[in-house]
C-alpha cells in the first residue's frame, strides 16, 4: 500500500451475515473521493460508493483480495489487502435494557432485556454481563454473568437480584453488554458496549424512615438497615447496642448486623437518633418451622381424628409471624388449619380431623409454615388401628346371683365394625387383685354390657375398667372404681370341728372354729350341733354365732357329733365328728422341740387314716380338757409345722396326733415340747444327807416343770474348799485350779456322793440345772468334813 | 457478667472539682454509648451526661453544662466525668449506667458530697 | 426540653393487687419511653423499653402500655419484691428526662 493510499481496514460483524468494512481515507482527500472497491476469491466483484466503508455478505471460508482504488481530484491510489474471516471481529450491537423495577418489600430488582436473535441467524450461546452500582458516586456492587441462547427469533430474558441494602437506602443503577461465543466464526469475539444505565429509585413518604420494616430473619443472617433522613443521624442502635453508621447518599445512612441473634417475642428493636428524633423499626429474628415431630393420628370415638405432634425446635416467631400448620389429607383431598397466636415452647399441638365415611385409611401430610419457610410430616393411618377409647363413663354393678355379677358402661364413639378387648380389674380386700380380659363387639350406640362370674359370694369386690380395640393401639384410662359386695350364698363347708370329753368324763366338749369369709359365703347366723347314735338323733338348741363350743351330756357309748353353720341363705354340709376315741395302748410321750416360732411334726404315711390327722396342742402345766388350738391336716399329709401367735419360749406345750378314720378318731402320737428352749430360772434345792471325814452325801430335789423352761439334760456339780464369808474366792471363779466338776447327764439321779475329801475342812458346793437352752442358776452351801478318827 | 463500678466520690468543698471513673467489665465496651446519672439524697433519678460508643457525641442537662465533662477510654474500659466548679447541689450519688438511649445496666453509684 | 409526670407520687398496696402507675409527657414522644424500678440503697433496675417491651429475665407480671403523651405501667398481681421505687423516663430527645417517681409501699 502506497502512502497516500486507504489504509488499515477493518471488518466487523454483528450478526455473521454482513460485515461492515471499513478504511481509513488517503492523508489529503476531501470530500469529493470515489472508491472503487473490488473482491477477488475465484470470481472478481467491484462495487464505487463514496464512503469509507463497506457492507459486504459474509465471506465464505478461505483468503480474498481485497482492492480499493480511491479517485480524488489530483490523481487516484490503490490498496491491496487480504482478508479472512479471521480478520474480521464479531461485536454484538449494544443491548437495550426494555424494563427495570423494583419489589421494594423483598429488596429485589427485575431486569427485563430483548436479545435481538432474529438477526442472528446461527445458534450461539451468548453471555450477558450484568452491572449493579449503588449510590450516585456509582459505587459497584454486584457483577454478574448470565448465559442465553439465541436460537433465531427475538427473546425476551429476565434476571432478578436480592439486594442485601434495601432497595429505599440509595439509588441503584443497572447496565448491560453482551459477548457472542459461535462455534463456527473463526474470527474475533468482542463484548458489546454497554447499555444505556437505567436506575431505580425510592420516593420518600412522609412516613417511614428506617427500612427494611418488620422484617423477618433467619437467626444468624447479616442484614443491612438504613434511615432515610432530611436530618443529620447521629446514630444507630439494635437493641441497646450501638453500630457504626455506613453513609450513603445525603443524610441516609446505614448499618450492618451480622450474624444476628435470637429476637425477644416483642422483636429486636433497630433504632436511628438524630439531633430531634428517634426513628425505629423491629427485626424478627426466628427460625423456620422444624419438621413437626412425633406426628401421630389417633381417635378416641371413630368419629373424630386427633392428630397431635411436637413443633420441635421453638421458632421465636409469634402472633402474625407464628407458625401455621395445615393438616391435608390426600385420599379426600379435605384439610385443617391450626394458626397459633402464640407459640408454646415444646408442648404438643393438635388439630382434629372429621373422619369420613366408609374412609379408613388416611394419608396425612401436616404443612408447617412461617415468613422463614415451610416444613412437612407425612403419616399414613388405618384409623381402625388407632383407637385410643375415652375412658369408659356410667361404670356400673350389678348382681346376677351370689357369683356373678353385670357390668356396664359407657364408651363413646360409632364403633360397630370393631371389637373391644377389655380389661376387668378385680380386687378383693386383703387380696391380690386379679385381670381378666373380655372381647366384646363393638356397638353404635356407646352402651357396653358384660357378665363376671368365677366370683365369691358375700365378697367386697372393686372393679375398675379399661378398654382397647382388639387391633391394639392404646388402653384408654382406667373407669372410676366401683365397690361392690356380692350376695349371700349357703356356706359350702361345715366348720372344723373338735371334741373333748370333761375332765370328769361325763361331758362332751364340741368346739369348732368360724368358717373362714371363702367358706362362709355370708355372716353366719347360728349353728346346729346334733348327735346321733344307731338308735336316736338328739339336736341342741340353735347355737347363736359368735359362739364356737357346746357341751352335751353323753354316755361313753359311739355317738356322731354333727355341726352346721347357718347364714340368711342356708346352711352348710355338715362337719360330722365321732364322740369315742379308737384306743391305742401302746404309745409312749416324745420330747420335740421347735424352731424359734413353730414346731415341725413329722409321722408315717399311714393308709387306714383315711379322712384326716388332726394335731392338738395345750399349754402342759393348764388343767383338763387340754385344748389350746387343732389343726386339721389332710389324710396324705407325712408333716406339718404348727405355728401360733400364742407359744412363748419357754413354756412346754403337749402336742397329740390323732388319726382319723370314719369320723373316728385314734391317738397315733403323744408329745411335749417346747416351741424354743431357755435355760432353767431356778436351781435345784439341794441338802446335804449325810458327812464323814472324808465324803460328803448331798441329795436333790426336781425342778417345777414351769420354772425348767427346757428338757432338763443334766447338772453340775461343783465343789471346792472354801469357807463362808472370808474373802478366800468363791467356787465358781476362774483361775482356781482345785474346783472340781461333775456333770450329772442321768436327769433320774437324785443324790450324789463326794469322795476323797479332807478331814475338818469346809468345802463349797454348787449345784446347777441345764436344759439345752443354757445353764441355770447355782444354789451353793458351805459343808465340814468331820475329824478323822 | 456486665459490671460497672464506679470510683472517685468523696466530700468535697463547694468551688473545687472531682473526677469520678467507671470501670466496665462483661461486655464489648466500645459497642456502648454510656450515661451519668445522679440521685441527690431522698429524690429521684436525674439525668446528667451521655457519651456516643465512639465517644464522637457528647450531650449534658442544663444544670451541669460548662461544668462537667464526660469522656471515655474504650482501650482501658473507662467512662469518667470530670466535674469542676462544683456547687451544693451537685451533692448525689453519681451512677454510670449502660445504654445510649435506654439504661439497661447500671452501677451501684458514687456518692460525692459537696460542703463547706 | 421534655417534662415527664407521673402519678401517684406514693401508692399504698397488698400482695397480690393490680397497680398501674402513670406517666405523661409534656410533648408527644411516640413510645420511646422507659420504666425502671429502684429498690431502697440500690441502683435502678431496667423493666420495660419502648413503652411495652419487657426487658429479659423480668416477670411477666409486669407489662407496659400507651404512646404519644399516656403511659401506664402495670403490676397484674403485686408481690413481696415488688415494693420500691419506680421511674419513666423518655428517651425521645436529649435530655433524657425521668418522671420524679412512684414508690409503691405495703398497705
Known amino acids: 500500500q502506497k502512502k497516500g493510499a486507504p489504509h488499515d481496514l477493518k471488518c466487523v460483524t454483528n450478526n455473521l451475515q454482513v460485515w461492515n468494512c471499513s478504511w481509513k481515507a488517503p492523508s489529503g482527500t476531501g470530500r469529493g473521493t470515489d472508491y472503487e472497491v473490488c473482491i477477488e476469491n475465484r470470481s472478481r466483484s467491484c462495487y464505487q460508493l463514496e464512503k469509507t466503508s463497506i457492507k459486504i455478505p459474509a465471506l465464505s471460508h478461505g483468503d480474498y483480495e481485497i482492492t480499493i482504488n480511491s479517485l480524488h481530484d489530483f490523481g487516484s491510489s490503490t490498496s491491496k489487502f487480504t482478508l479472512n474471516e479471521q480478520n474480521v471481529s464479531l461485536i454484538p450491537d449494544t443491548p437495550e435494557i426494555l424494563n427495570l423495577s423494583a419489589d421494594f418489600s423483598t429488596s429485589t430488582l427485575y431486569l427485563k432485556w430483548n436479545d435481538r436473535g432474529s438477526v442472528f441467524p446461527h445458534r450461539s450461546n451468548v453471555i450477558w454481563e450484568i452491572k449493579v452500582l449503588r449510590k450516585e458516586s456509582m459505587e459497584l456492587v454486584k457483577l454478574v454473568t448470565h448465559n442465553t441462547t439465541l436460537n433465531g427469533k427475538d427473546t425476551l430474558h429476565h434476571w432478578s437480584w436480592a439486594s442485601d441494602m434495601p432497595l429505599e437506602c440509595a439509588i441503584h443503577f443497572v447496565e448491560i453488554r453482551c459477548y457472542i461465543d459461535n462455534l463456527h466464526f473463526s474470527g474475533l469475539e468482542e463484548w458489546s458496549d454497554w447499555s444505556p444505565v437505567k436506575n431505580i429509585s425510592w420516593i420518600p413518604d412522609s412516613q417511614t424512615k428506617v427500612f427494611p420494616q418488620d422484617k423477618v430473619i433467619l437467626v444468624g443472617s447479616d442484614i443491612t438497615f438504613c434511615c432515610v433522613s432530611q436530618e443529620k443521624v447521629l446514630s444507630a442502635l439494635i437493641g441497646h447496642t450501638n453500630c457504626p453508621l455506613i453513609h450513603l447518599d445525603g443524610e441516609n445512612v446505614a448499618i450492618k448486623i451480622r450474624n444476628i441473634s435470637v429476637s425477644a417475642s416483642s422483636g429486636t428493636n433497630v433504632v436511628f437518633t438524630t439531633e430531634d428524633n428517634i426513628f425505629g423499626t423491629v427485626i424478627f429474628a426466628g427460625y423456620p418451622p422444624d419438621t413437626p415431630q412425633q406426628l401421630n393420628c389417633e381417635t378416641h370415638d371413630l368419629k373424630e381424628i386427633i392428630c397431635s405432634w411436637n413443633p420441635g425446635r421453638v421458632t421465636a416467631l409469634v402472633g402474625p409471624r407464628a407458625t401455621s400448620y395445615t393438616l391435608v389429607e390426600s385420599f379426600s383431598g379435605k384439610y385443617v388449619r391450626l394458626k397459633r397466636a402464640e407459640a408454646p415452647t415444646n408442648e404438643s399441638y393438635q388439630l382434629l380431623f372429621q373422619m369420613l365415611p366408609n374412609q379408613e385409611i388416611y394419608n396425612f401430610t401436616l404443612n408447617a409454615h412461617n415468613p422463614l419457610g415451610r416444613s412437612q410430616s407425612t403419616i399414613l393411618v388405618n384409623i381402625t388401628e388407632k383407637v385410643y377409647p375415652h375412658t369408659p363413663t356410667s361404670f356400673k354393678v350389678k348382681d346376677i346371683n351370689s357369683t356373678a355379677v353385670k357390668l356396664s358402661w359407657h364408651l363413646p364413639g360409632n364403633f360397630a365394625k370393631i371389637n373391644f378387648l377389655c380389661e376387668i380389674e378385680i380386687k378383693k380386700s386383703n387380696s391380690v387383685q386379679e385381670q381378666r380380659n373380655v372381647t366384646i363387639k363393638g356397638v353404635e350406640n356407646s352402651s357396653y354390657l358384660v357378665a363376671l362370674d368365677k366370683l365369691n359370694p358375700y365378697t367386697l369386690y372393686t372393679f375398675r375398667i379399661r378398654c382397647s380395640t382388639e387391633t391394639f393401639w392404646k388402653w384408654s384410662k382406667w373407669s372410676n372404681k366401683k365397690q361392690h359386695l356380692t350376695t349371700e350364698a349357703s356356706p359350702s363347708k361345715g366348720p372344723d370341728t373338735w371334741r373333748e370329753w370333761s375332765s370328769d368324763g361325763k361331758n362332751l366338749i364340741i368346739y369348732w372354729k368360724p368358717l373362714p369369709i371363702n367358706e362362709a359365703n355370708g355372716k353366719i347366723l347360728s349353728y346346729n350341733v346334733s348327735c346321733s347314735s344307731d338308735e336316736e338323733t338328739q339336736s341342741l338348741s340353735e347355737i347363736p354365732d359368735p359362739q364356737h363350743k357346746a357341751e352335751i351330756r353323753l354316755d361313753k357309748n359311739d355317738y356322731i357329733i354333727s355341726v352346721v353353720a347357718k347364714n340368711s341363705v342356708g346352711s352348710s354340709p355338715p362337719s360330722k365328728i365321732a364322740s369315742m376315741e379308737i384306743p391305742n395302748d401302746d404309745l409312749k410321750i416324745e420330747q420335740v422341740v421347735g424352731m424359734g416360732k413353730g414346731i415341725l411334726l413329722t409321722w408315717h404315711y399311714d393308709p387306714n387314716m383315711t379322712c384326716d390327722y388332726v394335731i392338738k396342742w395345750c399349754n402342759s402345766s393348764r388343767s383338763e380338757p387340754c385344748l389350746m388350738d387343732w389343726r386339721k391336716v389332710p389324710s396324705n399329709s407325712t408333716e406339718t409345722v404348727i405355728e401360733s401367735d400364742e407359744f412363748r419360749p419357754g413354756i412346754r406345750y403337749n402336742f397329740f396326733l390323732y388319726g382319723c378314720r370314719n369320723q373316728g378318731y385314734q391317738l397315733l402320737r403323744s408329745m411335749i415340747g417346747y416351741i424354743e428352749e431357755l435355760a432353767p430360772i431356778v436351781a435345784p434345792n439341794f441338802t446335804v444327807e449325810d458327812t464323814s471325814a472324808d465324803s460328803i452325801l448331798v441329795k436333790w430335789e426336781d425342778i417345777p416343770v414351769e420354772e425348767l423352761r427346757g428338757f432338763l439334760r443334766g447338772y453340775l456339780f461343783y465343789f471346792g474348799k472354801g469357807e463362808r464369808d472370808t474373802s478366800k474366792m468363791r467356787v465358781l471363779e476362774s483361775g482356781r485350779s482345785d474346783i472340781k466338776v461333775k456333770n450329772i447327764t442321768d436327769i433320774s439321779q437324785k443324790t450324789l456322793r463326794i469322795a476323797d475329801l479332807q478331814g475338818k475342812t469346809s468345802y463349797h458346793l454348787v449345784l446347777r440345772a441345764y436344759t439345752d437352752g443354757g445353764v441355770g442358776p447355782e444354789k451353793s452351801m458351805y459343808v465340814v468334813t468331820k475329824e478323822n478318827s | 457478667q456486665v459490671q460497672l463500678v464506679e470510683s472517685g466520690g468523696g466530700v468535697v468543698q463547694p468551688g473545687r472539682s472531682l473526677r469520678l471513673s467507671c470501670a466496665a467489665s462483661?461486655?464489648?465496651?466500645?459497642?456502648?454509648?454510656m450515661n451519668w446519672v445522679r440521685q441527690a439524697p431522698g429524690k429521684g433519678l436525674e439525668w446528667v451526661a451521655v457519651i456516643w460508643f465512639d465517644g464522637s457525641i457528647k450531650y449534658y442537662a442544663d444544670s451541669v453544662k460548662g461544668r462537667f465533662t464526660i469522656s471515655r477510654d474504650n482501650s482501658k474500659n473507662t467512662l469518667y466525668l470530670q466535674m469542676n466548679s462544683l456547687r451544693a447541689e451537685d451533692t448525689a450519688i453519681y451512677y454510670c449506667a449502660r445504654g445510649q438511649l435506654v439504661q439497661d445496666f447500671w452501677g451501684r453509684g458514687t456518692l460525692v458530697t459537696v460542703s463547706s | 426540653d421534655i417534662q415527664m409526670t407521673q402519678s401517684p407520687s406514693t401508692l399504698s398496696a397488698s400482695v397480690g393487687d393490680r397497680v398501674t402507675i402513670t406517666c405523661r409527657a409534656s410533648?408527644?414522644?411516640?413510645?420511646?419511653l422507659a420504666w425502671y424500678q429502684q429498690k431502697p440503697g440500690k441502683a435502678p433496675n431496667l423493666l420495660m423499653y419502648k413503652a411495652s417491651n419487657l426487658e429479659s429475665g423480668v416477670p411477666s407480671r409486669f407489662s407496659g402500655s400507651g404512646s404519644g403523651t399516656e403511659f401506664t405501667l402495670t403490676i397484674t398481681s403485686l408481690q413481696p419484691d415488688d415494693f420500691a421505687s419506680y421511674y419513666c423516663q423518655q428517651y425521645k430527645s436529649n435530655p433524657l428526662t425521668f418522671g420524679g417517681g412512684t414508690k409503691v409501699e405495703i398497705k
Open positions: 462483661g461486655f464489648t465496651f466500645s459497642s456502648y454509648g
Open positions: 410533648q408527644s414522644i411516640s413510645s420511646w
